[in-house]
Interface confidence: medium
Amino acid sequence: IWSAVFLNSLFNQEVQIPLTESYCGPCPKNWICYKNNCYQFFDESKNWYESQASCMSQNASLLKVYSKEDQDLLKLVKSYHWMGLVHIPTNGSWQWEDGSILSPNLLTIIEMQKGDCALYASSFKGYIENCSTPNTYICMQRTV
Amino acid sequence: IWSAVFLNSLFNQEVQIPLTESYCGPCPKNWICYKNNCYQFFDESKNWYESQASCMSQNASLLKVYSKEDQDLLKLVKSYHWMGLVHIPTNGSWQWEDGSILSPNLLTIIEMQKGDCALYASSFKGYIENCSTPNTYICMQRTV
């Protein structure tokens, strides 16, 4: 019994996949795929706006944290990276690039420094930082 | 132009994937897929032998580091985890579970403790540890 059939269009061969195994994606080439989300960690330091532009140019957005369960790989991420969370001064809320509000209990927000952008750090922490500060960043693409 | 055709056997629909995008795997369900290798990080602490047995029971092996380029996701891994590297006292070499010798310049080996097993740590470091010490571990499955 097989859960899926993958048609290799190049050789027109069927590759059989056991029920317990599956393909992940699709994702941009050489991105990380996990629970059908695509992630990429970028080494070069950019400010938040440049990081956002870089992700957008790759048909992605900055990291959005929406589920500790579906994104449990993030708890093992080392260092600090820009994510897509921004502060809306008018109502004081934190929201994602797509306009959705940060769900309670998803991130521990550490608001010690002045800023309207947030760095993701391991164990689901968000450090508030000046948006102009250069940092590495994480892009994410949700698969359909 | 599309790089692959994925046949969804459940609904029998063809999903078209742009040239720049691709599927990754196949991997065990909910494992991380990167450059067609499958990885899983296990939270429970086990000694090296138990960790090896756990990976084997999932048709995988403990992490093997074979390429900084193909496995660059490992540089951002937080904490320390058993990998499949063991010390061979007879000839003093370090080898992987599959019997291959550790390639030079792949890992910085740090002998913090007396032992014959190695923990993987971020930035391609290997920490020598007593094989009986419980630690979290990384399983890996190479896709065909």
Partner: antibody, heavy 118, light 110 residues
Framework: QVQLVESGGGVVQPGRSLRLSCAAS????????MHWVRQAPGKGLEWVAV????????YYADSVKGRFTISRDNSKNTLYLQMNSLRAEDTAVYYC???????????WGQGTLVTVSS | QSVLTQPPSVSEAPRQRVTISCSGS????????VNWYQQLPGKAPKLLIY???LLPSGVSDRFSGSKSGTSASLAISGLQSEDEADYYC???????????FGGGTKLTVL
């Protein structure tokens, strides 16, 4: 370059009060959280208190809670530590330190000595 | 009694390697970044290692940090006489809502 200069230390009797200041220069003071850390003579470092960039968040060590108050005046680029009900065990060199998200205490002052003695 | 536990003193000969341990709990080292500070006699502390194992610019690569579970270590290789100092580990503690230091380790270069 970043500079932190503490002042206000001295000898004070038990039960009395003292206010320490830390003058900051060489960086945008109003953007950074700041800490006070102390060190009793011949002893180790002990964290005392932290204040967020705008003064809205403050945390204290249990040993000083209710007696010490951390504050800041961003218009003067100055950090303060108001110490009330002083005890002999508060005798220490008090350091102010800048907090950075990624490096925690990346810059320290040279310290000011507070001696609580009758 | 410090929340983080370090050996009071260590000593080693020049050019040798020494390791200083730091033991904590899940609420500090286990869940937060560990930093190491060097304090030379009569001086203010200086940041030596941040985020477990990263070196600030200007710090010699003879210093290295590591962390496993609720313990951390500082290693100094190629010991020099100018390394004689007190070394402190530190981390934020989620339970105490405060920053905690180890008791400090005095390094003597023989």
């Amino acid at each position: 370059q970043v500079q932190l200069v503490e002042s206000g230390g001295g000898v004070v009797q038990p039960g009395r009060s003292l206010r320490l200041s830390c003058a900051a220069s060489g960086f945008t003071f109003s953007s950074y959280a700041m800490h006070w850390v102390r060190q009793a003579p011949g002893k180790g470092l002990e964290w005392v208190a932290v204040i967020s960039y705008d003064g809205s968040n403050k945390y204290y060590a249990d040993s000083v809670k209710g007696r010490f108050t951390i504050s800041r005046d961003n218009s003067k680029n100055t950090l303060y530590l108001q110490m009330n009900s002083l005890r002999a065990e508060d005798t220490a060199v008090y350091y102010c330190a800048r907090y950075d998200n990624t490096r925690i205490f990346d810059y320290w002052g040279q310290g000011t000595l507070v001696t609580v003695s009758s | 009694q410090s929340v983080l536990t370090q050996p009071p003193s260590v000593s080693e000969a020049p050019r040798q390697r020494v390791t200083i341990s730091c033991s904590g709990s899940s609420s500090n080292i286990g869940n937060n970044a560990v930093n190491w500070y060097q304090q030379l006699p009569g001086k203010a502390p200086k940041l030596l290692i941040y985020y477990d194992d990263l070196l600030p610019s200007g710090v010699s690569d003879r210093f290295s940090g590591s962390k496993s579970g609720t313990s951390a270590s500082l290693a100094i290789s190629g010991l020099q006489s100018e390394d004689e100092a007190d070394y402190y580990c530190a981390a934020w503690d989620d339970s105490l809502n405060g920053y905690v230091f180890g008791g400090g380790t005095k390094l003597t270069v023989l």
